[in-house]
Amino acid sequence: DTYKSEIAHRFKDLGEQYFKGLVLIAFSQHLQQCPYEEHVKLVREVTEFAKTCVADESAENCDKSIHTLFGDKLCAIPSLREHYGDLADCCEKEEPERNECFLQHKNDNPDIPKLKPDPVALCADFQEDEQKFWGKYLYEIARRHPYFYAPELLYYAIIYKDVFSECCQAADKAACLLPKIEHLREKVLTSAAKQRLKCASIQKFGERAFKAWSLARLSQRFPKADFTEISKIVTDLAKVHKECCHGDLLECADDRADLAKYICENQDTISTKLKECCDKPLLEKSHCIAEAKRDELPADLNPLEHDFVEDKEVCKNYKEAKHVFLGTFLYEYSRRHPDYSVSLLLRIAKIYEATLEDCCAKEDPPACYATVFDKFQPLVDEPKNLIKQNCELFEKLGEYGFQNALIVRYTKKVPQVSTPTLVEVARKLGLVGSRCCKRPEEERLSCAEDYLSLVLNRLCVLHEKTPVSEKVTKCCTESLVNRRPCFSALTPDETYKPKEFVEGTFTFHADLCTLPEDEKQIKKQTALVELLKHKPHATEEQLRTVLGNFAAFVQKCCAAPDHEACFAVEGPKFVIEIRGILA
């Protein structure tokens, strides 16, 4: 459909509340350092303008694209260069280059302090102005996660508001709020990581990579739907994510709503698990569909070999319609293997494709590809064995100890990577233990590998901004589906020149005593990385001794009457001790 005014069309489709929310998210994801009030002003102006276009689509500037309108708004900010430096250079470009330029300036690791929930203050804000409270939440999440899936953020904002509606009435606000906020925070962080991977796959590996990922995922989730149905949903979903990743948030949210509507209208041919979802209001409905439980497998599935090995037309199908044929293979394989990770399914499809590419050029293709399914077993065994070993290590060491083992492992593999990044990534990798190791056997593989893909994508995104390791660049860019095996296969870097010992790195202060447990751990793990960068060949025994001594040193000083004085005296002794242990 063509509309005289795109902004009027989106305003009418989405309604004022969602329109304002999405515009706020869009501005917050681009201008991540601007105060909330500045964004509110921009949103108000854009909304007023949209309303004039709804009243008269022929009004001045209403025919302009949303990119043009948003870009003009950003570029009109007087302090743009002062606060954002070379982002202001984008304003010298014309659309669509200007929008591309804005996208390139999104910062995945903005210097914004961590949000610390204060139940009393938050409840006061909530009761004073619910609308502002909702907007502030969108702003705070969007500026910290510039690729967050905008329509899904609107959903989380509703859940956030509901938590406060309930808990601010409670006698003990903190007891009600804090666990709920923490639970929501984990969900939001996972959602941010999932979307970041989707955007990375589209932007770095192309739309086809994203479609293959979605095809495998949806085939696992909706095994009763046939290939044609899944293909249609994949195509529409790719459009939605391309738009959101490209900053076209209004179009993205609108198209996502259309897709949810289509899925619900056709749920009989898609999945038996969508009934509850489809009775919900729009944002909950879309979220529910995205999180839907896996449907049961149809009972009458034929062995895959019939169509992909025994059928005499395999090479004809492959040669004449490569993408469709390989798509059908991925669909059929995925729906039969809900227990496999998406990355593993895509690796299997790659092997199948490579085998046909080779065999179909030979004299006797059927004889050549007859054993293709046997080639898949090593691909399945590799992650299964790895998960088994790591889960055993997790059971033995516990979460903190397992994280430390990963810190050692990854610092030795890629010591050039910055210390904060190594700590963040290794800590997240370590969470795979509590997330997946307790799961039933048939869920472990997909849980672990799909989660690791999210964490390694975070490493790749951070590393791309300031590349320091050829190994990391290689693993991140060569193949999306082989990232995890690539990182797993890295060995300690023997070419690394150890860092000089800097005493300041091991200087601690009284604030350590009052830090929450997780922040205390981060301090210790930061020291561990620095230690390894100084002594890459330190033995496990030496490291264990240093960590034990460190814990004792901190405990001693935090029990002393004057924390700071203790750290001043004991700190230098501790440094000498470290050097002695590692000598």
Epitope: T228, D307, E310, A321, T328
Partner: nanobody
Framework: EVQLLESGGGLVQPGGSLRLSCAAS????????VAWFRQAPGKEREFVAG????????YYADSVKGRFTISRDNSKNTLYLQMNSLRPEDTAVYYC???????????????????WGQGTLVTVSS
């Protein structure tokens, strides 16, 4: 889910031609891999020709290559089999079969097709 109804069979002399039709309902024929099979008295059902769903790739049994042509008209949701240079050994009941959601895979294995028409008899005799 898919209903198929064949027509166009009959008696024809050797060397003659016939055009079989298969009307589908309940599903768009262009989304479905469809095929013609035949069964002569006292023999097993055998694959004759097939066409992919969504992608017009055609498949033929060696015995009919160059004589038979499979096609479909998406607007009419109908599958056709144009049979030329007919021989007595082509005498059989011809069945239309469908595999929904299988765009390309037009297997020659009858068991893999969940939907079948009731068949139309073709007799080639002088």
């Amino acid at each position: 889910e898919v209903q198929l109804l064949e027509s166009g069979g009959g008696l024809v002399q050797p060397g003659g031609s016939l055009r079989l039709s298969c009307a589908a309902s309940g599903r768009y024929i262009d989304e479905t891999a469809v095929a013609w099979f035949r069964q002569a008295p006292g023999k097993e059902r055998e694959f004759v020709a097939g066409i992919g769903g969504g992608v017009d790739i055609t498949y033929y049994a060696d015995s009919v290559k160059g004589r038979f042509t499979i096609s479909r008209d998406n607007s009419k949701n109908t599958l056709y089999l144009q049979m030329n240079s007919l021989r007595p050994e082509d005498t059989a009941v011809y069945y239309c079969a469908a595999r929904p959601g299988k765009p390309l895979i037009t297997s020659k294995v009858a068991d893999l097709y969940p939907y079948w028409g009731q068949g139309t008899l073709v007799t080639v005799s002088s």
